[in-house]
């Protein structure tokens, strides 16, 4: 696959996983009521990060935000902290990726700094995908732990008003959220591995600049502003060159490899 | 204003079938639901099930599967509730009644008769 | 299903007179997602279909006279009657609106001296 195709799928992949990352965090359904085994209720409960619902059969739904800091568990603030640094993470190397995309000229940045930036965001993408998951994780974990807690005392004890009230314990299962965020960090985790991937294809290699020899009849050796030789040479990169006007730039009809001077 | 406007009273053979029919005005009838409920002369009110009228799910109560069945048409904005096989256990007043907030019923319509009878 | 207990089945009270009733439910109605208790309270008079008094146990329904107060959680309730007045001569139903099916409780008959 050429490096221009490997940055840009990276990058694409990446910007999808993000936008799953964005979605899983807002979504409200990151625990959902079980109803398995359960009596059959006309409300149903789901719980997000941000907010926990209620819908009834009657149609109504009603969310309530959780407007306190301090009484939430702080498994449920770690989950939180985790997935804004995923998206933060994940702001951040979109940016860079932007500039770090062979297929977009700016100014005169060359492949060095084009692969530096391609590296960074390739980075910034991973660790956003492991945030995520890691989040994700976190909450399932939470999930199951509390899962199994009330399956054993199912029927509890619950001091209401007036002494003890037999209460059926509402018991929470994996909702939407989770999944969105687990394919959604992985597809991040792994664009973030194609532009690093892309990276390495993007670095310079000496070796393609050992032997310089000028594919122009006669005495026509095209200069860059900048003072340097085009490499146009017939090693190993005898494919069908194309001599832009404005300097020696030269352009592969395939990418597979890059010149220092390809864009800039 | 919110109405439900249920047909008349029926009066039927045992063994026999009927269809009442409830029509809804006043508000988006699609999006809503529609219950049932049975009341004996003198006696308490029995819930028979409701309709999603926005899906076409339905949800009966045990006792009355077999007995009833629910639907309705959109484009009328009207639900209608079978009964079959009928025998006298089954001569009461049925109301159809709109889901409100905390699953309760909010408004009613008139009630319908029906009188099983050889 | 959830049997729905009304307490008393018939009451004979003067005007003025405060008035109370309970409803006990064989399961708590206390939904713990949103903290509320599904428990809807109807008054039904001769010849009309049931009206809505209360739902959530609690909560009043627009239109209905503020002498109308329904409490408790879990699976005991009231409904209390602050000063009864001649329309509110009615039979009253709680009815379980957590579970399915939705059941009702035998009624509460409410008789004016």
């Known amino acids: 696959m050429s490096v221009t195709a490997c940055q840009g799928l990276g990058f694409v992949v990446s910007l999808i996983g993000f936008a799953g990352i964005i979605a899983a965090t807002c979504m409200d359904q990151w625990s959902t009521q079980d109803l398995y085994n359960n009596p059959v209720t006309a409300v149903f409960n789901y719980q997000g990060l941000w907010r926990s619902c209620v819908r009834e059969s009657s149609g109504f739904t009603e969310c309530r935000g959780y407007f306190t800091l301090l009484g939430l568990p702080a498994m449920l603030q770690a989950v939180r902290a985790l997935m804004i640094v995923g998206i933060v993470l994940g702001v951040i190397g979109i940016l860079v990726s932007i500039f770090a995309l062979k297929c977009i000229r700016i100014g005169s940045m060359d492949d060095s700094a084009k692969a530096k930036m391609t590296l960074t965001s390739g980075i910034l993408f991973i660790i956003s995908g492991i945030c995520a998951i890691i989040g994700v994780s976190v909450f399932a974990n939470m999930l199951v732990t509390n899962f199994w807690m009330s399956t054993a005392n199912m029927y509890s004890g619950m001091g209401g008003m007036g002494g003890m009230v037999q209460t059926v314990q509402t018991r929470y299962t994996f909702g939407a959220a989770l999944f969105v965020g687990w394919v959604a960090g992985g597809l991040t985790l792994i664009g973030g591995v194609m532009m690093c991937i892309a990276c390495r294809g993007l670095t310079p290699d000496d070796s393609n600049f050992k032997a310089v020899s000028y594919h122009a009849s006669g005495q026509n050796v095209a200069y860059r502003p900048g003072g340097f030789k085009a490499s146009t040479g017939f090693g190993s990169n005898t494919r069908n060159k194309k001599i832009y006007d404005g300097g020696a730039r030269t352009e592969d009809d395939e990418q597979s490899h890059p010149t220092k001077y390809d864009y800039v | 204003q919110i109405q439900l406007q249920q047909s008349g009273a029926e009066l039927a053979r045992p063994r026999a079938s009927v269809k009442l029919s409830c029509k809804a005005s006043?508000?988006?009838?699609?999006?809503?639901?529609i219950s049932w409920v049975k009341q004996r002369p003198g006696q308490g009110l029995e819930w028979i099930g409701e309709?999603?009228?926005?899906?076409?799910?339905?949800y009966y109560n045990e006792n009355f599967k077999g007995k009833a069945t629910l639907t309705a048409d959109k484009s009328s904005s009207t639900a209608y509730m079978e009964l079959r096989s009928l025998t006298s256990e089954d001569s009461a007043v049925y109301f159809c009644a709109r889901s409100y907030y905390g699953n309760s019923f909010a408004y009613w319509g008139q009630g319908t008769l029906v009188t099983v009878s050889a | 299903d959830i049997v729905m207990t009304q307490s008393p089945s018939s009451l004979t009270v003067t005007a003025r007179e405060k008035v109370t009733m309970n409803c006990k439910s064989t399961?708590?109605?206390?939904?713990?997602?949103?903290?509320?208790?599904?428990l809807t309270w109807y008054q039904q008079k001769p010849g009309q279909p049931p009206k809505l008094l209360i739902y959530?146990?609690?909560t009043r329904e627009s239109g209905v006279p503020d002498r109308f107060t329904g409490s408790g959680s879990g699976t005991d309730f009231t409904l209390t009657i602050s000063s009864v007045q001649a329309e509110d001569l009615a039979v009253y139903y709680c009815?379980?609106?957590?579970?399915?099916?939705?059941?009702f409780g035998g009624g509460t008959k409410l008789e004016i001296k």
């Open positions: 006043g508000y988006t009838f699609t999006s809503d639901v």
């Open positions: 009815q379980n609106a957590y579970y399915y099916p939705f059941t």
């Open positions: 959530w146990a609690s």
């Open positions: 399961q708590s109605l206390l939904n713990s997602g949103n903290q509320k208790n599904y």
């Open positions: 309709s999603y009228l926005r899906n076409g799910n339905t």
